[in-house]
């Protein structure tokens, strides 16, 4: 019979993807690098169903996702089209707010305490979620 592929140890499988949920915070760029070192990427939310899954696992905590507009337009880190894709912004967001006093606006997207999205200063140390496709994750032995 065919051997079932599975996610690495400590990752959660859902709908042919593997997810890893941090329990500590990093700036967006450092969270992005962390996922890349795992041959993964910051989570890309493509449906309401995936939104609910992630929201269930992170709880009411600010958490980075793989969406940013550091180079102008909003972009998902895996190339998923932003304009036509799923969105779940809070009302009046994104607003690229400059009033925080930290310099610049707000270029990185995160899940807020109610799961809806907000743009914020990319240097804030929020938790994050990594995602990789199940087929990719299973090409090598799981991390033990």
């Amino acid at each position: 019979g065919s051997e079932r592929t599975c996610c690495p140890v400590n990752w959660v499988e859902h709908e042919r993807s593997c997810y890893w949920f941090s329990r500590s915070g990093k700036a967006w760029a450092d969270a992005d690098n962390y996922c890349r070192l795992e041959d993964a990427h910051l989570v890309v939310v493509t449906s309401w169903e995936e939104q609910k899954f992630v929201q269930h696992h992170i709880g009411p905590v600010n958490t980075w996702m793989g969406l940013h507009d550091q180079n102008g337009p909003w972009k998902w880190v895996d190339g998923t089209d932003y304009e036509t894709g799923f969105k779940n912004w809070r009302p009046e967001q994104p607003d690229d707010w400059y009033g925080h006093g930290l310099g610049g606006g707000e270029d990185c997207a995160h899940f807020t305490d109610d799961g809806r999205w907000n743009d914020d200063v990319c240097q804030r140390p929020y938790r994050w979620v990594c995602e990789t496709e199940l087929d990719k994750a299973s090409q090598e032995p799981p991390l033990l």
Epitope: S24, K26, D30, L37, D39, E140, P141, L143
Partner: antibody, heavy 123, light 107 residues
């Protein structure tokens, strides 16, 4: 026992190229990110480059970006560093170092190092 | 890049002394710090990971503490084999950066 054995160092002219290799044993090589770190004789340590478990992502220090390329062959348990356009300031001992992921800490570290291979760039 | 400022750069101590080495990070790096010992002509060996966890096989006279921006490596009772160079490494943010090193010499 985890072991890392570097090779490929030597004397090269400025502008020349070298390819370093690091053969790994004693652990599941394909399950770990890997690094190159260098040390100018008598000086401190400088991280050079890292590569993810499957090689899909690579990272470089600004000082070597565009000149050095890190790669790996998981079927051979071997890490590589292709060094082009070498400069006198690249003269150093180059260490291969195993990455370590501690997910409880969301922490990447470097836990085991090879003995190093010496690269000398003459101008 | 995050700067790791290590002090002192060298120190002289006697067998049995308590030795403390400090690394200061230029920004908050949580506890993403390791401490390494390097003897002449040898590769570095990790003593401490995640700021305060002792590497398996490392004597308990070595300990690490700190979080945020200030980190300390302590050798509670210096032994002859401890005379070496010590480095801290931050791995919170890319690129990883080392402290400048501390040479522990015999007084």
């Amino acid at each position: 026992e985890v072991q890392l054995l570097e090779s490929g160092g030597g004397l090269v002219q400025s502008g020349g190229s070298l390819r370093l290799s690091c053969e790994a044993s004693g652990f599941i090589f394909s399950s770990y990110a890997m690094n190159w770190v260098r040390q100018v004789p008598g000086k401190g340590l400088e991280w050079v480059s890292a590569i993810s478990r499957r090689g899909g992502s690579t990272f470089y220090a600004d000082s070597v970006k565009g000149r050095f390329t890190i790669s790996r062959d998981n079927s051979k348990n071997t890490l590589y560093l292709q060094m082009n356009s070498l400069r006198a300031e690249d003269t150093a001992v180059y260490f291969c170092a195993k990455g370590e992921l501690l997910e409880d800490y969301s922490y990447y570290g470097i836990d085991v190092w090879g003995q190093g291979t010496t690269v000398t760039v003459s101008s | 890049d995050i700067q790791m400022t290590q002090s002192p750069s060298s120190l002289s101590a006697s067998v049995g002394d308590r030795v403390t080495i400090t690394c200061r990070a230029s920004q908050d790096i949580r506890n993403d710090v390791g401490w390494y010992q390097q003897k002449p002509g040898k590769a570095p060996e990790r003593l401490i990971y995640a700021a305060s966890s002792l590497q398996r096989g490392v004597p308990s006279r070595f300990s690490g503490s700190g979080s945020g921006t200030e980190f300390t490596l302590t050798i509670s009772s210096l032994q002859p084999e401890d005379f070496a160079r010590y480095y801290c490494l931050q791995h919170y943010s890319y690129p990883p950066t080392f402290g400048g090193g501390t040479k522990v010499e015999i007084k």
